[in-house]
């Protein structure tokens, strides 16, 4: 699935903004990992367009930054991808989900590597 090139034509939504988002989630990834963040809308229904923001700047989808419905993927993560990520309602900038992402220099333990 190529999230980066998909465009969603959106129909009617029954939901209006739900409750305030919960606490910030802290996540650690290894260098080279794919950072995957998921943010289902409160109440389960669509809430108009959303935007992912990193350290205050809106993220534009690219070959490395893939955006899908309520989902963000940053491929081949590096230290520079560490930071505060939020999924916001585009229209109001209301934060739906908030993540603190740290990318360490070492690959994550899930990778197959030869030990010493």
């Amino acid at each position: 699935e190529s999230l980066g090139t998909e465009q969603r034509v959106v129909g009617r939504a029954a939901e209006v903004p739900g409750p305030e988002p919960g606490q910030q989630e802290q996540l650690v990834f290894g260098s080279g990992d794919a950072v995957e963040l998921s943010c289902p809308p409160p109440g389960g229904g669509p809430m108009g367009p959303t935007v992912w923001v990193k350290d205050g700047t809106g993220l534009v989808p690219s070959e490395r930054v893939l955006v899908g419905p309520q989902r963000l993927q940053v491929l081949n993560a590096s230290h520079e991808d560490s930071g505060a990520y939020s999924c916001r309602q585009r229209l109001t900038q209301r934060v739906l989900c908030h993540f603190s992402v740290r990318v360490t220099d070492a690959p994550s333990s899930g990778d197959d590597e030869d030990g010493e």
Partner: antibody, heavy 121, light 110 residues
Framework: EVQLLESGGGLVQPGGSLRLSCAAS????????MSWVRQAPGKGLEWVSG????????YYADSVKGRFTISRDNSKNTLYLQMNSLRAEDTAVYYC??????????????WGQGTLVTVSS | QSVLTQPPSASGTPGQRVTISCSGS????????VSWYQQLPGTAPKLLIY???KRPSGVPDRFSGSKSGTSASLAISGLRSEDEADYYC???????????FGGGTKLTVL
């Protein structure tokens, strides 16, 4: 300086098609959400469609759903509106409107001068 | 008929304060921000107010916006002849999944 220049309007028969273009300059086009808004002669503003960079979503007004298609070519800094199965009630000046930066509250902060579409036999 | 309701006309004399109302519902104004646009005769609309009450740079402080519940208002103080224009409110509507505009208010400076 932000500039939006619409083109492609004209006279078309009912049932016909037109493609409007909006050439953008003065800002990083790919990073901004864009919309089309129309105004029938002597009438008020009506939002037609919007394309959102942040999540790739596209929205349409019920009045044009299934007939109009919004798209963009970031390499050409151009927004498009493909209009099919045109009706007399689609006659209007069509404006291209730029939204605010993605990390700010949404609003149409710049507008083009508009292009007139006339649907008549 | 527009989803957002505005009076079709308003008027005032130079120096006066004029208020234009915009009434909606919980699916738009009640749960979203309102913006206001000014359209001078024969020109494209121009942003006047956004996020209910914020003014873009370059817009005189004679223009102010407010919101209460499902209604919004645009106030113009120290009315001038160049304020004669059409004024539109707008908001996103969650149930329609799109932007909606008011029908517009034609302001006449007497």
């Amino acid at each position: 300086e932000v500039q939006l220049l619409e083109s492609g309007g004209g006279l078309v028969q009912p049932g016909g098609s037109l493609r409007l273009s909006c050439a953008a300059s003065g800002f990083t086009f790919s990073s901004y959400d864009m919309s089309w808004v129309r105004q029938a002669p002597g009438k008020g503003l009506e939002w037609v469609s919007g394309i959102y960079s942040g999540d790739g979503s596209i929205y349409y007004a019920d009045s044009v759903k299934g007939r109009f298609t919004i798209s963009r070519d970031n390499s050409k800094n151009t927004l498009y509106l493909q209009m099919n199965s045109l009706r007399a009630e689609d006659t209007a000046v069509y404006y291209c409107a730029k939204d605010a930066p993605m990390n700010e509250m949404s609003r149409f902060d710049y507008w083009g001068q508009g292009t007139l579409v006339t649907v008549s036999s | 008929q527009s989803v957002l309701t505005q009076p079709p006309s308003a008027s005032g004399t130079p120096g006066q304060r004029v208020t234009i109302s915009c009434s909606g519902s919980s699916s738009n104004i009640g749960n979203n921000y309102v913006s206001w646009y000014q359209q001078l005769p024969g020109t494209a609309p121009k942003l006047l107010i956004y996020a209910d009450s914020k003014r873009p740079s370059g817009v005189p402080d004679r223009f102010s916006g407010s919101k209460s519940g499902t209604s919004a208002s645009l106030a113009i103080s120290g009315l001038r002849s160049e304020d004669e224009a059409d004024y539109y409110c707008a908001s996103w509507d969650y149930s329609l999944s799109g932007y909606v505009f008011g029908g517009g208010t034609k302001l006449t400076v007497l």
